[in-house]
């Protein structure tokens, strides 16, 4: 992580601790699947991490922004449109859809702080919601009625 | 959220902004299933939120600690040991296991801060890893070999 200058909130902006109180951003997953041992394909493995054994398998994609806290986020990306058959682990079963589980999470962006006379006084953190996909889930398709 | 006194890190403790940089804690899921419309049972619905349409359905359990940031965390709890059949959505298929997707996330605990002479000077935030379950995933069981 690069070093950030200390935060100097100006009047009307949250203090760091106030921001901390609302800070709610996932860390990178424990360990994305090793590409060599678990190639990224539409199949459900019988070993390896959860995301490769799932019948809605997914990979993790790094989203890095040095002006954001956290700087590194990971997005799940489904490897199949449908669920993989439990019987074979390889062919898809169109009766199930592989859907992303989304999560609106709070992130903080580094923005220049301005003093009372508009002078630049370090950096402040601006809180925003940021949509991240956590995993792929095998679901029954919605029935329109 | 209750109001917390301002943080006064003592020597050797991270500043709020340093902590912020590492703060990585999920917010509550978008909307836990409404209990009435989607009763918590081992079946995959054809409507409703993702956690009730999943063939590894789950519910959310609130974990509240007023001395922790965030104060509210949600843990997924699987409603079935196995995956639900895509054919019917009502009975289990023992060829698939419903497993929790875990996530070690950083939380902050409010602890009294002590000045140089041991005097109490407000509260500081202590960073810790905290295991949270995000969702239940239908997986092929591990093959022991």
């Amino acid at each position: 992580y690069s070093h950030w200058p200390s935060c100097c909130p100006s009047k009307g902006q949250d203090t760091s601790e106030e921001l901390l109180r609302w800070s709610t951003v996932p860390v990178p997953p424990l360990e994305p699947a090793r590409p060599n041992r678990h190639p990224e394909s539409c199949r459900a493995s019988e070993d390896g991490p959860l995301n490769s054994r799932a019948i809605s398998p997914w990979r993790y994609e790094l989203d890095r922004d040095l002006n954001r806290l956290p700087q590194d986020l990971y997005h799940a990306r489904c490897l199949c449109p449908h669920c993989v058959s439990l019987q074979t682990g390889s062919h898809m079963d169109p009766r199930g859809n592989s859907e992303l589980l989304y999560h609106n999470q709070t992130v903080f962006y580094r923005r220049p702080c301005h003093g009372e006379k508009g002078t630049h006084k370090g950096y402040c953190l601006e809180r925003r919601l940021y949509r991240v996909s956590l995993a792929c889930v095998c679901v029954r398709p919605r029935v329109m009625g | 959220y209750s109001h917390w006194p301002s943080c006064c890190p003592s020597k050797g403790q991270d500043t709020s902004e340093e902590l912020l940089r590492w703060s990585t804690v999920p917010v509550p899921p978008l909307e836990p299933a409404r209990p009435n419309r989607h009763p918590e049972s081992c079946r995959a619905s054809e409507d409703g939120p993702l956690n009730s349409r999943a063939i590894s359905p789950w519910r959310y359990e609130l974990d509240r600690d007023l001395n922790r940031l965030p104060q509210d965390l949600y843990h997924a709890r699987c409603l079935c040991p196995h995956c639900v059949s895509l054919q019917t959505g009502s009975h289990m298929d023992p060829r698939g296991n419903s497993e929790l997707l875990y996530h070690n996330q950083t939380v902050f605990y409010r602890r009294p801060c002590h000045g140089e002479k041991g005097t109490h000077k407000g509260y500081c935030l202590e960073r810790r890893l905290y295991r949270v379950s995000l969702a239940c995933v239908c997986v092929r069981p591990r093959v022991m070999g």
Epitope: Q87 | Q87, H91
Partner: antibody, heavy 121, light 107 residues
Framework: QVQLQESGPGLVKPSETLSLTCTVS????????WSWIRQPPGKGLEWIGF???????NYNPSLKSRVTISVDTSKNQFSLKLSSVTAADTAVYYC???????????????WGQGTLVTVSS | DIQMTQSPSSLSASVGDRVTITCRAS??????LNWYQQKPGKAPKLLIY???SLQSGVPSRFSGSGSGTDFTLTISSLQPEDFATYYC?????????FGGGTKVEIK
């Protein structure tokens, strides 16, 4: 060889509950999808629902609010209850064993001989 | 729900004829299709399961084919005992549904 036999009243009054029992002989009641199917006079077949392993049930959405299928393993029987009946529920009611193929209900075999239930006051 | 459409709804044929009945599903059902024979006053009897597998004890003149949405039941040489009504049934998704039936009558 598994055989199924339906029993129950042949006449039910409107708004009352139709109750039928199917007795299974010559085989185990475990690990099958015990099902009910009906056929109105001169018409086609309609699946009502099943009970699997004395636990999970699945009903035709068109009847779901009125149907209960339960299994009594001690008696090797399963039963159908259909509430708030009307003349439209007049039919021959069949019980059948839903074959368990790859943990799914696959086909019906064997069937009971069927019992005609008339809804009339 | 998956709709099952059978054609024709009835047909007349003679003993020894080759008879073909078709069943169409409103969406792909892979090979999750079964065929039944029903005689008047009797319960249906399973003939073919999983689109093309002959049930034990059923004469080999009966055969099934197809996958996806279009399926066929063929009786290679019609026998007197084959005059009956035939139903297709999908087991791809619940609710399980049947076709409207095809009545095979003596010409």
């Amino acid at each position: 060889q598994v055989q199924l036999q339906e029993s129950g009243p042949g006449l039910v009054k409107p708004s009352e509950t139709l109750s039928l029992t199917c007795t299974v002989s010559g085989g185990s009641i475990s690990n099958y999808f015990w099902s009910w199917i009906r056929q109105p006079p001169g018409k086609g077949l309609e699946w009502i629902g099943f009970n699997y392993n004395s636990g999970s049930t699945n009903y035709n959405p068109s009847l779901k609010s009125r149907v209960t299928i339960s299994v009594d393993t001690s008696k090797n029987q399963f039963s159908l209850k259909l509430s708030s009946v009307t003349a439209a529920d007049t039919a021959v009611y069949y019980c059948a064993r839903g074959y368990n193929w790859n943990y799914e209900i696959a086909w019906f075999d064997p069937w009971g001989q069927g019992t005609l239930v008339t809804v009339s006051s | 729900d998956i709709q099952m459409t059978q054609s024709p709804s009835s047909l007349s044929a003679s003993v020894g004829d080759r008879v073909t009945i078709t069943c169409r599903a409103s969406q792909s059902i892979s090979s999750y299709l079964n065929w039944y024979q029903q005689k008047p006053g009797k319960a249906p009897k399973l003939l073919i399961y999983a689109a093309s597998s002959l049930q034990s004890g059923v004469p080999s003149r009966f055969s099934g084919s197809g996958s996806g949405t279009d399926f066929t039941l063929t009786i290679s040489s019609l026998q007197p005992e084959d005059f009956a009504t035939y139903y297709c049934q999908q087991s791809y998704l619940t609710p399980l549904t049947f076709g409207g039936g095809t009545k095979v009558e003596i010409k």
